[in-house]
Interface confidence: low
C-alpha cells in the first residue's frame, strides 16, 4: 500500500510535507515485534503500559503486570523471567554508547505482587538478564559479574578484577561493542542455565581518546575512553565459562583459543551456544581476512572445556576480508554439531552452507546471482531465511522456507506475494519450535506487522498496520520514488531517484545525491520512510538520488571487495558516475547539484566535492572521517589493513580529505560534527578545518557542543533547519 | 545552574544522630539527581548517598542500614538522616546535584557543589 500519488480534482487539498512535519516525527511508522515466551505466546506493551500476554491458540489475553505497578518505579522496560515467577523493572535509563546503558532493576513477585525486599540489586546495572530456565540472574555491576540463583538471593560474585577503563568483565569494551559483536553485553547463558559463559577485556595498554564535555560547570570535564584507533594496540580478551549451579566449585574455566589464531594479534568474535555441554566459538585474525571457528565440549573429568583441532573450521577470504559486514554465525541444527552458515560461495556471492564435518565438503544449500542475507530459524524440518532473490532487486528482503526434512530440499517464497506492492521488504520473528511467526514489512509502502502459522504460513491476524499514519498522509502530496539501474563498465549501479511530486520530465531540477557509501551497506532499498529528504522533494521540488556504488552490500563479492585496501576512491568514483548518467536524463540543472552525507557518508561527500570535476555546487559534511588513521582499529583494518610502511600506510595517506583541501576552493562547503563524538571524533572535522584555513579556502561550519554521533534531540532540529537554509541558498530556492 | 547550601552539621557522640539539609535554588530542582558526599581529611572525597529525580536511592556499604537520603521537590530540598554515627563517620558533608542517574560514584560527574558542612563525632 503506497499512499495515494494520483492528483484528481482533490489536488487543492493536498499540500506538501512541511519541514516542521519531519523534525516533529509526524508520519512516523509503528511495528509490532511480539516478546515470545513459548511457542504459542508472546508478552506485548499495550498503548496504555500495561504488560499483556496474549496465547494465540485459546485466543485468550491478560495482563500480567500493570501499568501501575510499571509507573511505581518509572519503569521504561521489563522481562519476565522463563518460569514466570519473576519480571525485572528497569528505570533510570542512562544512555552510554551506541547499545550500552545503565539502569536500576527493581525485582517483582508476581507470585505476591510485591517487590522483591532484601538483597536488592545494586546501581547502576551494566547490563542484567534471567537464565534461559528458572529464575536466576546474572548481572554486571562495576565491570564485575554477579549471579544470583533466585532474586531474593544473595549474590555470588564471579569477577574481582574489573575496573572502569582497564577490565571488562561481561560487557564490551568501546570497540568491541561498535565495531565487533555489537552488543552491549558480553555474556552468554547455556540454553537450560547450566553454564554462564562470559568475555573479559583487557583495556590497559590502549590509548585513550579524550574530549572536553562542556555541561554547564566552570571547568568542562574530560571524557576518557580507551579507544584503539588504526594500528593502535588492541583489546585483550579471554573467554571464561563457569558452573552456575556451583559456582564456587571450580569457578571460572578459561576457554582455549585455537593455535592458528593464537600466533598474533586476533579477536573474539562471537559465541553460540550448541547443548548446555557443547559450545561454539568465532575468532578472528587481526589482519580479518581469516577466521575460526571452534566447538568445545565440556569434560565431566577435568571439569575443564575442550576444544579439539577437528572441530574447528576455517573461513578465510583471498578478494577480500572475511564475511560481510561481521563473519556470520552458525545456526546448529539439531543433532548438536553440524550447522548452517552464510559465506561466499565459488561464485563470490554469500550463500547458506550445511557444514557436516568440514568447510570443505559443506554443502551449498542456496545458489544464484543473488545473497541470502539472515537465517532465521532452523527447526527439525523447516529452514527459514531471508535473500534479496525475488525479481532480482538487491533492494528487497523476502522470507523463504526450505523444507530440509525431505529430498530434495523444495523451496518457498513466504512473503513475495502476500502484499506485493506494499511490501517488498521484511523480517520476521519466530516463537519456538517456529510454530508461529511475526513478519514485519518495512516498505516500500506503509509498514505492516502481521502473525502466520508456522507449519502452513497462513496469515493469523494484522498486528499493526498504521491506519492512522495511512489518513493522516491522505492529504500530503508525497513525492514519487523509482528503484532503478545503471549499467556502467561492467558494474550495476542500483539507484533511488526521489523526484518532485508534479515532477515533469521537460524540466529542468536541483539534484541532492545523499551518500553513505560504507563497506556492506546498502542505501537503495524497498523501504517506507518519510524524511527530510521526502520534505526537499516535495516542498522545495528538488530531486534526490541514492547510489549503491563499489563497496556495497549483497551483490556478490566483486562489487562489495571493490573497495577493499582503497577506501576513499571507487565509492566517491561511483557517485560522481552516476552524476553524470543523471545529467544525461534531461532533467537534472547540472548547475545546481550537490551532495551529501553523515559519518562514512560525509567522507564520501567531502572528496566528491573536492574530486576538482566541477559537478558540485556545494555539500554538507556530517561528522566525517577525514583520515582513516583517527577511525577505529577493528572497522578500519577489516577494509584497510594497517597504517605500517610494509602493508598500507600509503594508501591511508592518500586517501584523507586534508590531502585535498586546495579542491575545495571552488564549492561551497558545510561541515559538521557534535564536539562530544565518541565514535567518529571531532578531531576528524577539526583536522578538515585546520587544513581548509592553513590553504586559505573558505567554507562554513557547525558545531553542536556536548553530542554525540548521532547529534539528537534539540541539536536535530537545528541540524536539519541549517542544512535546508544552505542547500536553499545554494539553490536559490527562496525562503 | 543549581546553587546549593547545605546546614545541619555539629559535633555530636557516637551512636547519635544528625539531620542533614541541602536546599537548592532554581525552579528545576526535581529534575536533577542529587547526592551526598563526604571528605575527611586527607581522604579522597566519597559519595555516601545519592537519590534520583524519581526518588531511587542509593547508599555507599559503609552506611547501608544507617542514614537515609529522601528528597522533598517542593521545598527544594534534599535530606541526609544519619543514625548510629561512628566516629568513623567524622568528615565535611557535601550536596552535590547533577542531571541524569544518580549513580555516579565519581565527584567528577557531579557539576554543581555546595559548601560543606562539617560532621564531628566524638566516642
Known amino acids: 500500500l503506497r499512499p495515494s500519488r494520483v492528483h484528481n480534482s482533490e489536488e487543492n487539498t493536498m499540500r506538501a510535507l512541511t519541514l516542521k512535519d519531519i523534525l516533529n516525527g509526524t508520519f512516523s511508522y509503528k511495528t509490532f515485534f511480539p516478546n515470545w515466551i513459548s511457542g504459542q505466546e508472546y508478552l506485548h506493551q499495550s498503548a496504555d503500559n500495561n504488560i499483556v500476554l496474549y496465547n494465540i491458540e485459546t485466543g485468550q489475553s491478560y495482563t500480567i503486570l500493570s501499568n501501575r505497578t510499571m509507573k511505581s518505579v518509572n519503569a521504561s522496560n521489563y522481562g519476565l523471567s522463563p518460569d514466570r515467577q519473576f519480571v525485572y523493572l528497569e528505570s533510570d535509563y542512562s544512555k552510554l554508547w551506541r547499545y550500552s546503558y545503565t539502569a536500576t532493576y527493581y525485582i517483582y513477585d508476581l507470585s505476591n505482587g510485591e517487590f522483591v525486599r532484601g538483597n536488592e540489586l545494586p546501581r547502576p546495572i551494566q547490563y542484567l538478564c534471567w537464565s534461559p530456565v528458572g529464575s536466576k540472574l546474572a548481572y554486571v555491576y562495576q565491570n564485575n559479574i554477579y549471579l544470583k540463583q533466585r532474586p531474593g538471593d544473595p549474590p555470588f560474585q564471579i569477577t574481582f578484577n574489573g575496573r572502569e577503563n582497564k577490565i571488562f568483565n561481561g560487557i564490551p569494551d568501546w570497540v568491541y561493542e561498535e565495531e565487533m559483536l555489537p552488543t552491549k553485553y558480553a555474556l552468554w547463558w547455556s540454553p537450560n542455565g547450566k553454564f554462564l559463559a562470559y568475555a573479559e577485556f583487557n583495556d590497559k595498554d590502549i590509548p585513550v581518546i579524550a574530549y572536553s564535555y562542556y555541561g554547564d560547570e566552570q571547568y568542562p570535564r574530560t571524557i576518557n575512553i580507551p579507544y584503539p584507533k588504526a594500528g593502535a594496540k588492541n583489546p585483550v580478551v579471554r573467554i571464561f565459562i563457569i558452573d552456575t549451579t556451583y559456582p564456587a566449585y571450580v569457578g571460572p574455566q578459561e576457554v582455549p583459543v585455537p593455535a592458528m589464531i593464537a600466533s598474533s594479534d586476533y579477536y573474539f568474535s562471537w559465541l553460540t551456544w550448541v547443548t548446555d555441554e557443547r559450545v561454539c566459538l568465532q575468532w578472528l585474525k587481526r589482519v580479518q581476512n581469516v577466521s575460526v571457528l571452534s566447538i568445545c565440549d565440556f569434560r565431566e573429568d577435568w571439569q575443564t572445556w575442550d576444544c579439539p583441532k577437528t572441530q574447528e573450521h576455517i573461513e578465510e577470504s583471498r578478494t577480500g576480508w572475511a564475511g560481510g559486514f561481521f563473519v556470520s554465525r552458525p545456526v546448529f541444527s539439531y543433532d548438536a554439531i553440524s550447522y548452517y552458515k552464510i559465506f561466499s560461495d565459488k561464485d563470490g556471492y554469500k550463500h547458506i552452507h550445511y557444514i557436516k564435518d568440514t568447510v570443505e565438503n559443506a554443502i551449498q544449500i542456496t545458489s544464484g546471482k543473488w545473497e541470502a542475507i539472515n537465517i532465521f530459524r532452523v527447526t527439525q524440518d523447516s529452514l527459514f531465511y531471508s535473500s534479496n532473490e525475488f525479481e532480482e532487486y538487491p533492494g528487497r528482503r523476502n522470507i523463504y522456507r526450505i523444507s530440509i526434512g525431505s529430498y530434495p530440499p523444495s523451496k518457498k517464497c513466504v512473503t513475495c506475494h502476500l502484499r506485493k506492492e506494499r511490501c517488498q521488504y521484511y523480517t520476521a520473528s519466530f516463537s519456538d519450535y517456529a510454530k508461529y511467526y511475526a513478519l514485519v514489512c518495512y516498505g516500500p509502502g506503509i509498514p505492516i506487522s502481521t502473525l502466520h502459522d508456522g507449519r502452513t504460513d497462513q496469515e493469523i491476524k494484522i498486528l499493526e498496520e498504521n491506519k492512522e499514519l495511512e489518513n493522516a498522509l491522505k492529504n500530503i502530496q508525497l513525492p514519487k520514488e523509482e528503484i532503478k539501474k545503471l549499467e556502467v563498465d561492467e558494474i550495476t549501479l542500483w539507484y533511488k531517484m526521489i523526484l518532485p511530486p508534479q515532477f515533469d520530465r521537460s524540466k529542468k531540477y536541483p539534484l541532492l545525491i545523499q551518500v553513505y557509501g560504507g563497506p556492506c551497506s546498502q542505501s537503495v532499498r524497498s523501504v517506507f520512510a518519510v524524511n527530510w529528504i521526502s520534505y526537499l522533494a516535495s516542498k522545495e521540488g528538488m530531486v534526490i538520488a541514492l547510489v549503491d556504488g563499489r563497496g556495497t552490500a549483497f551483490q556478490g563479492d566483486k562489487l562489495l571487495y571493490a573497495v577493499y585496501r582503497k577506501l576513499g576512491v571507487y565509492e566517491v568514483e561511483d557517485q560522481i558516475t552516476a552524476v553524470r548518467k543523471f545529467i544525461e536524463m534531461g532533467f537534472i540543472d547540472e548547475k545546481r547539484i550537490a551532495i551529501w552525507g553523515w559519518s562514512y557518508g560525509g567522507y564520501v561527500s567531502s572528496l566528491a566535492l573536492a574530486s576538482g570535476t566541477g559537478l558540485f555546487k556545494c555539500g554538507i559534511a556530517v561528522a566525517p572521517v577525514s583520515s582513516w588513521e583517527y577511525y577505529a582499529s577493528v572497522y578500519t583494518e577489516r577494509f584497510m589493513g594497517l597504517p605500517t610502511k610494509d602493508d598500507n600506510l600509503e594508501h591511508y595517506k592518500n586517501s584523507t580529505v586534508m590531502a585535498r583541501a586546495e579542491y575545495f576552493r571552488n564549492v561551497d562547503y558545510l561541515l559538521i560534527h557534535g564536539t562530544a563524538d565518541d565514535n567518529v571524533h571531532f578531531q576528524n572535522s577539526a583536522q578538515i578545518a585546520k587544513a581548509l584555513v592553513n590553504a586559505q579556502v573558505d567554507f562554513q561550519a557547525m558545531w553542536y557542543s556536548d553530542q554525540n554521533h548521532g547529534l539528537s534531540g534539540l541539536s536535530t532540529n537545528h541540524l536539519y533547519t541549517h542544512m535546508t537554509h544552505f542547500l536553499k541558498q545554494c539553490f536559490s530556492l527562496s525562503d | 545552574q543549581v546553587q546549593l547550601q547545605e546546614s545541619g552539621g555539629g559535633l555530636v557522640e557516637a551512636e547519635g544522630s544528625l539531620r542533614l539539609s541541602c536546599i537548592a535554588s532554581?525552579?528545576?530542582?526535581?529534575?536533577?539527581?542529587m547526592g551526598w558526599f563526604r571528605q575527611a581529611p586527607g581522604k579522597e572525597r566519597e559519595l555516601v548517598a545519592a537519590i534520583s529525580s524519581g526518588g531511587s536511592a542509593y547508599y555507599a556499604d559503609s552506611v547501608k542500614g544507617r542514614f537515609t537520603i529522601s528528597r522533598d521537590n517542593a521545598r527544594n530540598t534534599v535530606y541526609l538522616q544519619t543514625n548510629s554515627l561512628k566516629p568513623e563517620d567524622t568528615a565535611v558533608y557535601y550536596c552535590?546535584?547533577?542531571?541524569?542517574?544518580?549513580?555516579?560514584?565519581?565527584?567528577?560527574?557531579?557539576?554543581?557543589w555546595g559548601q560543606g558542612t562539617q560532621v564531628t563525632v566524638s566516642s
Open positions: 552535590a546535584a547533577r542531571r541524569g542517574s544518580a549513580y555516579y560514584t565519581n565527584r567528577i560527574d557531579w557539576p554543581y
Open positions: 532554581g525552579r528545576t530542582f526535581g529534575t536533577y539527581a
